[in-house]
Interface confidence: low
């Protein structure tokens, strides 16, 4: 069965749910925890053995319009002498987030949810070595 | 998507702000990307600042499963495979947006929620405070 039969609805208070047209959902974009802030250690992007830079992408038809992406500065990692060690690899760490995309169709506008992959920083890893026979 | 008529005359001026409430299509673009970090890479084991991944599940949220990283050590793994306490493993945190069912249990009414997740760990030089 595609949808559970009446009496087996998963939702405990369907009468209190707002009516929504088929094929869509109602989304309040007033963000819960809007003022929450990241409490990361200071300047870790510069102090890391796999340092990274940040760039901001901006799109007025996306909510939120600003998305910050990290890029690893080096292929290798920074050793104790401050030099790049290419026997190790700086690799990006990624995380998915949701955004709302606004699309214009003639004089109408529609909204679509989209998963976006954000690079949040870099870590230093031992490389995988493939031995050729 | 679900189309919403614009102002009469369809002016060229772009609406700078998104409306507080929008109707969105149920189909999420890129929804089928791999969301399990254990399957997408083994960086959490190969890193000099390795981490464990903890699964957090909440059916009132989309996505219902989110993975949280916890650094395994205070220090970092050196070339000999030992923990070097002259360096620090620190979590990389990121704010992400998820959907929260609002009112609770409603099938197709959501609100955006900002949550803070630790995505992985990185090895950093410590900040040394010299006492005068």
């Amino acid at each position: 069965r595609k949808i559970p039969k009446v009496g087996h609805t998963f939702f405990q208070k369907p009468e209190s749910c707002p009516p929504v047209p088929g094929g869509s959902m109602k989304l309040d974009i007033g963000i819960i925890n809007e003022n929450q802030r990241v409490s990361m250690s200071r300047n870790i992007e510069s102090r890391s053995t796999s340092p990274w830079n940040y760039t901001v992408t901006w799109d007025p038809n996306r909510y939120p319009s600003e998305v910050v992406q990290a890029q690893c500065r080096n292929l290798g990692c920074i050793n104790a002498q401050g030099k790049e060690d290419i026997s190790m690899n700086s690799v990006p760490i990624q995380q998915e987030t949701l955004v709302v995309r606004r699309k214009h169709q003639g004089c109408s506008v529609s909204f679509q949810l989209e998963k976006v992959l954000v690079t949040v920083g870099c870590t230093c890893v031992t490389p995988v070595i493939h031995h050729v026979q | 998507g679900i189309t919403i008529p614009r102002n009469p005359g369809c002016p060229n001026s772009e609406d700078k702000n998104f409306p507080r409430t929008v109707m969105v299509n149920l189909n999420i673009h890129n929804r089928n990307t791999n969301t399990n970090p254990k399957r997408s890479s083994d960086y959490y084991n190969r890193s000099t600042s390795p981490w464990n991944l903890h699964r957090n599940e909440d059916p009132e949220r989309y996505p219902s499963v989110i993975w949280e990283a916890k650094c395994r050590h205070l220090g970092c793994i050196n070339a000999d495979g030992n923990v070097d306490y002259h360096m620090n493993s620190v979590p990389i945190q990121q704010e992400i947006l998820v959907l929260r069912r609002e009112p609770p249990h409603c099938p197709n009414s959501f609100r955006l929620e900002k949550i803070l997740v630790s995505v992985g760990c990185t090895c950093v030089t410590p900040i040394v405070h010299h006492v005068a």
Partner: nanobody, 119 residues
């Protein structure tokens, strides 16, 4: 056609045990997260437990943690729920469910198996 068929329910005394099974067909079982949900008399459905595609991770609602164990056998396309230390409040129809979809939690359900815990 997708089918989920539960079995193993019945009448059991408080403190007793039951093992529920769910036989799946019509889809690639090993590709989906699977769930057990339950509906107590006169109540809405409650999510009970879930298990990842490869069985590597399980998750439980607080009220059953330490008493229930979810498992799966991908080769046999089967989902299981081992229920120990059963309580009267565990009385419900138990359903297995497949996947996650917006806006619903689950896109396919079984017909359910009744578990009654009573002395």
């Amino acid at each position: 056609e997708v089918q989920l068929v539960e079995s193993g329910g019945g009448l059991v005394q408080p403190g007793g045990s039951l093992r529920l099974s769910c036989a799946a067909s019509g889809f690639t079982f090993s590709s989906y997260r699977m769930y057990w949900v339950r509906q107590a008399p006169g109540k809405g459905l409650e999510w009970v437990a879930s298990i990842e595609q490869d069985g590597s991770e399980e998750y439980y609602v607080d009220s059953v943690k330490g008493r229930f164990t979810i498992s799966r056998d991908n080769a046999k396309k089967s989902l299981f729920l081992q229920m120990n230390s059963l309580r009267a409040e565990d009385t419900a129809v138990y359903y297995c469910a497949k996947g996650e979809i917006l806006p619903l939690y689950f896109d396919y359900w079984g017909q359910g198996t009744l578990v009654t815990v009573s002395s």
